[in-house]
């Protein structure tokens, strides 16, 4: 987790002087309770925004925005801590939005925005907005939540950013799978334009279960600039057992950008549909 | 412009099931989380179930679930709603809508949906 551009955080607006700073997570106010306190923030919203840094690398970031209740509260607060945890990693990110100047009502609601926190594909995310000094331990909790959850780099928006095009994200393979005969699978994809190699994984399974009963791996060598944007095709030999009639492809490339951790293609080959079974006809009619 | 065309409503007894559909046009559909929302004679509206872009993320709120299910076909623009073991208290005009920004929030919406369909109602009934 990290922050976009970080000098160039603004949180002022007119009518209020506002300072945007790093944050532990753990206000002064848990420590020194107050005696009065704000409100909760209002109509959390949160949304996938795309933001270019100065280097002009494009990257997904939550835009975060809420309103102020209209309550009298208002005049307490002093202002807000945003949290974005990563829940699969546990960590954690936060930043206060400090005010320099009171509060007043005025006639439009007072509304709030930030889009800094630069997320990851495929990620779920918990946001909280804690209005500040957070509540006394036993007074009414003063924040809102929204667990976030970011596209993937199959998404066409998401595609185009630099973490999916530094996972291979551009590259479509087109696999194409065709079972011939003799018990072998012809596999077929569009080589990217990069002198890396390729590996296809193959995961056999019987029809309708989901523990494999063959598993094979091949190596595909970088190939030549010549060979860039064409077809390379590859045939497979299955294990013959009756009944492993369901196969997976998975093309994992070893791309520079991504090396290991490169996003994978993978293409399914179902089981043959079986014919009915038609009814044994008897050889005797019974006159009984 | 955006639209979204809810059908499969109608009159149906309790226990029994319907099938919602909402056909979707004037926007990149597989873009967008899409939800279904509801709001009952003389009720405000209630957020029913969302699914993300991809079907890969699904949510439905306590009243609804075990019983109700969700789907999209992003090749077909379309969005369902698969209502099973109907109840009396599941009488209502269902809208389908649309996210307004990008992403998923699970157990409700993000933000603002901006674009409803005219509804499609239910009416469960003996």
């Known amino acids: 987790l990290r922050l976009l551009d970080h000098r160039a955080l603004v949180c002022s607006q007119p009518g209020l002087n506002c300072t945007v700073k790093n944050s532990t997570c753990l206000d002064d106010s848990w420590i020194h309770p107050r005696n009065l306190t704000p409100s909760s923030p209002k109509d959390l919203q949160i949304q996938l925004h795309f933001a270019h840094t100065q280097q002009g690398d494009l990257f997904p970031v939550a835009h975060i925005e809420w309103t102020l209740q209209t309550d009298a509260s208002i005049l307490y607060l002093e202002g807000a801590e945003l949290s974005v945890l990563q829940l699969n990693t546990n960590e954690r990110l936060c930043v206060r939005f400090e005010f320099l100047s009171k509060l007043r009502h005025h006639h439009r609601r007072w509304r709030f925005t930030f889009s800094h926190f630069v997320v990851d594909p495929d990620q779920e995310y918990e946001v909280t907005v804690h209005h500040l000094p957070k509540p006394i331990p036993d007074g009414d909790p003063n924040h809102q939540s929204k667990n976030f959850l970011v596209p993937d780099c199959e998404h066409a928006r998401m595609k185009v950013t630099t973490p999916c095009m530094s996972s291979g994200s551009l590259w479509d393979p087109n696999i194409t799978v065709e079972t011939l005969e003799a018990h072998q699978l012809r596999v077929s994809f569009t080589l990217w334009n990069e002198s890396t190699h390729y590996q296809i994984l193959l995961t056999s399974f019987p029809h309708m279960e989901n523990h494999s009963c063959f598993e094979h791996m091949h190596h595909i060598p970088a190939p030549r600039p010549e060979e860039f944007h064409q077809r390379s095709n590859v045939t497979l030999t299955l294990r013959n057992l009756k009944g492993c009639c369901r196969h997976q492809v998975q093309i994992q490339p070893f791309f520079s950008s991504c090396l290991n951790d490169c996003l994978r293609h993978s293409a399914t080959v179902s089981c043959p549909e079986m014919p009915d079974t038609p009814e044994p006809i008897p050889d005797y009619m019974p006159l009984w | 412009q955006v639209q979204l065309v809810e059908s499969g409503g109608g009159l149906v007894q309790p226990g029994r099931s319907l099938r919602l559909s909402c056909a979707a046009s004037?926007?990149?559909?597989?873009?967008?989380?899409m939800h279904w929302v509801r709001q009952a004679p003389g009720k405000g509206l209630e957020w029913v179930s969302g699914?993300?872009?991809?079907?890969?993320?699904?949510g439905y709120a306590d009243s609804v679930k075990g019983r109700f299910t969700i789907s999209r076909d992003n090749a077909k623009n379309s969005l369902y709603l698969q209502m099973n073991s109907l109840r009396a208290e599941d009488t209502a005009l269902y809208y389908c809508?649309?996210?307004?920004?990008?992403?998923?929030?699970?157990?409700?919406?993000?933000?603002?949906?901006?674009?409803w369909g005219q509804g499609t109602l239910v009416t469960v009934s003996s």
């Open positions: 809508a649309k996210e307004k920004g990008l992403g998923y929030c699970s157990g409700g919406t993000c933000g603002d949906l901006d674009n």
């Open positions: 699914i993300s872009w991809n079907s890969g993320s699904i």
């Open positions: 004037g926007f990149t559909f597989d873009d967008y989380a």
